[in-house]
């Protein structure tokens, strides 16, 4: 039975040209995590972290994706095309797969500064 839950950073925004951390956390289960997959909105793989073999960045993203922190992923040199959904898939046993969703909105620099200024603390 799958008892775990995935907590994510949810809906986030970041500045064009900047970087953003995508984070997922699996809780409420004793299942062993064997691999975490990170996918983009079009289901193309960004990176994986295999429990035994470590991080592997997909070749197309090697210049713009950095592993971590933890099981998260750092997306760098953001463009407007990076706006969209991102998915973390936790491969575990005996539970199976857990999937989390993050929505990233990449904003033009001036808009990002403006929205940040009016965020409620």
């Amino acid at each position: 039975m799958m008892t775990g839950t995935i907590e994510t950073t949810g809906n986030i925004s970041a500045k064009k040209g900047g970087s953003v951390i995508l984070q997922c956390h699996l809780s409420s289960t004793m299942a062993q995590v064997t691999q975490v997959n990170w996918e983009q909105h079009d289901h193309s793989l960004l990176a994986i972290r295999n429990a035994e073999l470590g991080w592997h960045i997909y070749p197309a993203f090697k210049d713009r994706v950095a592993p971590g922190p933890g099981l998260g992923l750092t997306l760098q040199s953001l463009t407007m095309n990076d706006t969209g959904e991102y998915f973390c898939t936790y491969h575990t046993y005996p539970d199976g797969t857990y999937r989390g969703r993050i929505f990233l909105e990449v904003l033009e620099s001036s808009v990002a500064e403006h929205s940040a200024r009016f965020q409620i603390p």
């Epitope: 064997t34 793989l45 994986i48 295999n50 035994e52 073999l53 470590g54 491969h91 046993y93 005996p94």
Partner: antibody, heavy 121, light 107 residues
Framework: QVQLVQSGTEVKKPGASVKVSCKAS????????ITWVRQAPGQGLEWMGW????????NYAQKLQGRVTMTTDTSTSTAYMELRSLRSDDTAVYYC??????????????WGQGTLVTVSS | DIQMTQSPSSLSASVGDRVTITCRAS??????LAWYQQKPGKVPKVLIY???TLQSGVPSRFSGSGSGTDFTLTISSLQPEDVATYYC?????????FGGGTKVEIK
Amino acid sequence: QVQLVQSGTEVKKPGASVKVSCKASGYTFSSYAITWVRQAPGQGLEWMGWISAYNGNTNYAQKLQGRVTMTTDTSTSTAYMELRSLRSDDTAVYYCARVDFWSGYNYFDYWGQGTLVTVSS
Amino acid sequence: DIQMTQSPSSLSASVGDRVTITCRASQGISNYLAWYQQKPGKVPKVLIYAASTLQSGVPSRFSGSGSGTDFTLTISSLQPEDVATYYCQKSNSAPLTFGGGTKVEIK
């Protein structure tokens, strides 16, 4: 097309070492892992370990720890498996195979043709 | 370590028969299971991964099912070219242990 081509038959004396090579072509070598599997005459398949061609991380079967070393050379897209302190029960066909771990399911999708290693005094 | 046990170790069936091979894991592995076919004198070939996903190019008469500890490989209509030894393998994490194999022959 994906191909894994292994080195030729080896005959070794007990106590010696053997190094088997596996040259990959038809895919981005550094984006996958290579596993090694052996099969003694008339017996089943035995997993020996695997190595990431991306970062060099390895994981070996417990019974072979200390006797086996797996390495890769990304400049030549070649994987190597060295087995030391050979015994007669190491006589087997040794296979390399590519691991598809991007799916999260770690299955072996392409195999080399096998290398027969005979250990005999 | 998780052990993989296959049954039967060998079987003989007629062309056109439905053939079922079972594989049991000593602990739950969800659907992290692959099936391989090895024809006599040949290299192993993956048939199924993720317990039930047919590898590209594999005939549709092969199917896989199961989750947790109990898994099945089915050949819906046995063909002469299916004479081989079939192996299950846990594919969640190391060690990526194989089952002992099931030898399939034609009656």
